[in-house]
């Protein structure tokens, strides 16, 4: 058993039929010594009395509010929440697995510049009764600081007959040198209780790996005279790193018919413009990505060719 | 009506072990939470333990790992296994179906003496 927060403790349970649980003593907060009864959420059944209580907790009916009172004065409360470990791994139920990149993907970040700043996801089914608190770091034996913000509710999707829910966190590392090298892995640890049940989900990350620019904006097309031929230029986004001559991109410039089965044609540059044929119809779309190291493209910055 | 008749007590020295049982009757006994309270010589009742409807137990402090309530609802049986016991666990022990031991049976003397 440990403490979550002031009053909040978190007992962890292995979690298989007929398992035995865990004795927790739990002890009233007051000066007093005599005549202190225990009862267990809003049931008025006493469970028991003494300053010092020894409970059994083995499932989620023996989880919950724990209040010792006397004389009808409630003195303190005890919240007992549930970490439950099966077949040796702690459960996963309250956030979907994201499977991208890789199974078992449950928090996804991203940054869009080397400041330091980032976001990092997390999708659920669950919609009510849901608390979520977000710490960070970067190392884990002498850890920096990365002050996150509080997780909220970001979006809302129907999938099937599902509805799903992301929430989403701001993190900014607290002293940031965007042109270091980096050598230790940015933590993030987040715990999430739902009702009685709580679980913690970590990830580790250089910040050169989560990477994903904005897209490229003021996307704008030239005709050339007397040609099929266009010239499209664009600029760096915004809240990508400065300066660029240090920070660079590269960019992908496609032209897409209107069916998808249309061939596409595409051209890399590390300038901030290009010459492409604008067919009838089609869409000219760019994108950007780190010049030297190859994190993930931004979306698609587009402009119909009419 | 609600019937409860302890047994098991005796006299054990100090160190010894005994198992109480209680036969209960007249009520779900299954869906109710239970308990055992004892009363030493001179002194008020004093809770002991308590077991809930799912078998999780709950003890007073002074029991520190020496006792262990259980029951067994196919036979409408309250247990009480009391291991390492000492002077000062001479008393008469009740099993009850309430905290204040208001329903309860007319209990089983233990007294532990050398």
């Known amino acids: 058993i440990w403490e979550l927060k002031k009053d909040v403790y978190v007992v962890e349970l292995d979690w298989y039929p007929d398992a035995p649980g865990e004795m927790v003593v739990l002890t009233c907060d007051t000066p007093e010594e005599d005549g202190i009864t225990w009862t267990l959420d809003q049931s008025s059944e006493v469970l028991g009395s003494g300053k010092t209580l020894t409970i059994q907790v083995k499932e989620f009916g023996d989880a919950g509010q724990y209040t010792c009172h006397k004389g009808g004065e409630v003195l303190s409360h005890s919240l007992l929440l549930l970490h439950k470990k099966e077949d040796g791994i702690w459960s996963t139920d309250i956030l979907k697995d994201q499977k991208e990149p890789k199974n078992k993907t449950f928090l996804r970040c991203e940054a869009k510049n080397y400041s330091g700043r980032f976001t990092c996801w997390w999708l659920t089914t669950i919609s009510t009764d849901l608390t979520f608190s977000v710490k960070s770091s970067r190392g884990s034996s002498d850890p920096q600081g990365v002050t996150c913000g509080a997780a909220t509710l970001s979006a809302e999707r129907v999938r099937g007959d599902n509805k799903e829910y992301e929430y989403s966190v701001e993190c900014q590392e607290d002293s940031a040198c965007p042109a270091a090298e980096e050598s230790l892995p940015i933590e993030v640890m987040v715990d999430a209780v739902h009702k009685l049940k709580y679980e913690n989900y970590t990830s580790s990350f250089f910040i050169r790996d989560i990477i994903k620019p904005d897209p490229p904006k003021n996307l704008q097309l030239k005709p050339l005279k007397n040609s099929r031929q266009v010239e499209v230029s664009w600029e760096y986004p915004d809240t990508w790193s400065t300066p660029h001559s240090y920070f660079s991109l590269t960019f992908c410039v496609q032209v897409q018919g209107k069916s998808k089965r249309e061939k596409k044609d595409r051209v890399f540059t590390d300038k901030t413009s290009a010459t492409v044929i604008c067919r009838k119809n089609a869409s000219i779309s760019v994108r950007a990505q780190d010049r030297y190291y190859s994190s993930s493209w931004s979306e698609w910055a587009s402009v119909p060719c009419s | 009506q609600v019937q409860l008749v302890e047994s098991g007590g005796g006299l054990v020295q100090p160190g010894g072990s005994l198992r109480l049982s209680c036969a209960a009757s007249?009520?779900?006994?299954?869906?109710?939470?239970m308990y055992w309270v004892r009363q030493a010589p001179g002194k008020g009742l004093e809770w002991v333990a308590t077991?809930?409807?799912?078998?999780?137990?709950v003890y007073a402090d002074f029991v520190k790992g020496r006792f262990t309530i259980s029951r067994d609802n196919a036979k409408n049986t309250l247990y009480l296994r009391m291991n390492s016991l000492k002077p000062e666990d001479t008393a008469l022990y009740y099993c009850?179906?309430?905290?204040?031991?208001?329903?309860r049976g007319q209990g089983t003397q233990v007294t532990v003496s050398s």
């Open positions: 009850a179906r309430d905290y204040a031991g208001r329903l």
């Open positions: 007249g009520f779900t006994f299954s869906s109710s939470w």
């Open positions: 077991v809930k409807t799912n078998n999780s137990t």
